[in-house]
Interface confidence: low
């Protein structure tokens, strides 16, 4: 059924648990999936007393919850781990919490880094 308007080929990658999982800590991830399946980017993070702690970022396989989302917006009210997904290259660089029940929108800017490419 096609890849959709905002085709995703690459995402920002991050893994807070990189030491244990034996991966790079951060960089760029090339997304690979089955033909005719859509690809997305995602971000997950915690908000500990106002301190934003990234958990993971990367590619996310075909998920209707992510369709046609150009921005990475978490909508759950007050989870322990926030999650958002989106379509479009590097769309998970910035991520936002906008609860469905209303309330202030909070956008998180990533710190400047020199990412490495993950293959």
């Amino acid at each position: 059924s096609g890849r959709g308007e905002a085709e995703t080929r690459e995402c920002i990658y991050y893994n807070a648990n990189w030491e244990l999982e034996r991966t790079n800590q951060s960089g760029l991830e090339r997304c690979e999936g089955e033909q005719d399946k859509r690809l997305h980017c995602y971000a997950s993070w915690r908000n500990s007393s106002g301190t934003i702690e990234l958990v993971k970022k990367g590619c996310w396989l075909d998920d209707f919850n992510c369709y046609d989302r150009q921005e990475c917006v978490a909508t759950e009210e007050n989870p322990q781990v926030y999650f958002c997904c989106c379509e479009g290259n590097f769309c998970n660089e910035r991520f936002t919490h906008l609860p469905e029940a209303g309330g202030p929108e909070v956008t998180y800017e990533p710190p400047p880094t020199a990412p490495t490419l993950l293959t």
Epitope: A16, N17, E19, L20, E21, S48, T51, E53, Q80, V81
Partner: antibody, heavy 117, light 107 residues
């Protein structure tokens, strides 16, 4: 990769005691550092952790120790500290430091703290 | 706080047996679940992290599974050095919490 603990011993209720955890063999500043304790004959109890400076060096504590125990770190010396104030009999335990907080993969040898008059 | 409940609390088994220990969280913790082994007088040792990932240096007879609230640690063929106490621990939400432990004894 090694964590070597020091401090501990016998202390009276209400008094203070400090524990140290000296790291070697890895880049200490990149890691969160955790403390876990084990009362005699009991299971493991999470005490708290301190994040790396990249995450602000902020701390999290168990409710049972909040306000009395303080975790700090000195990245230049590769040492994590646990300062214990207003000690109670129920704080008697073996205290362990450990690397990381999502999963604690390197542990110190443990040090015994006995709170008794 | 999230409660972690292990079962059984103790278990007798023989060398070569297949052993399963379960851990249940009081709420969804995704895969933020670790398993530790502890022998008397020693520090705990990380066996499994992220519910199913084997820590480097840990024998492949150990495996972990589960997600959400129900988790399992399996030892496929018990060896003499495996007799110890095993703990699960969630690192999803602070305060992090451990299960009460499962003591694995020789039958």
């Amino acid at each position: 990769m090694q964590l070597v603990q020091s401090g501990g011993g016998l202390v009276q209720p209400g008094r203070s005691l400090g524990l140290s955890c000296t790291a070697s063999g890895f880049t200490f500043g990149d890691y969160a550092m955790s403390w876990v304790r084990q009362a005699p004959g009991k299971g493991l109890e999470w005490v708290g952790f301190i994040r790396s400076k990249a995450y602000g060096g902020t701390t999290e504590y168990a409710a049972s120790v909040k306000g009395r125990l303080t975790i700090s770190r000195d990245d230049s010396k590769s040492i994590a500290y646990l300062q214990m104030n207003s000690l109670r009999a129920e704080d008697t335990a073996v205290y362990y430091c450990a690397r990381g907080h999502y999963g604690m993969d390197v542990w110190g040898q443990g040090t015994t703290v006995t709170v008794s008059s | 706080d999230i409660q972690m409940t292990q079962s059984p609390s103790s278990l007798s088994a023989s060398v070569g047996d297949r052993v399963t220990i379960t851990c249940r969280a009081s709420q969804n913790i995704s895969n933020f679940l670790n398993w530790y082994q502890q022998k008397p007088g020693k520090a705990p040792k990380l066996l499994i992290y992220s519910a199913s990932r084997l820590q480097r240096g840990v024998p492949s007879r150990f495996s972990g599974s589960g997600s959400g609230t129900d988790f399992t640690l399996t030892i496929s063929s018990l060896q003499p050095e495996d007799f110890a106490t095993y703990y699960c621990q969630q690192s999803y939400s602070t305060p992090y919490t451990f299960g009460q432990g499962t003591k694995l004894e020789i039958k």
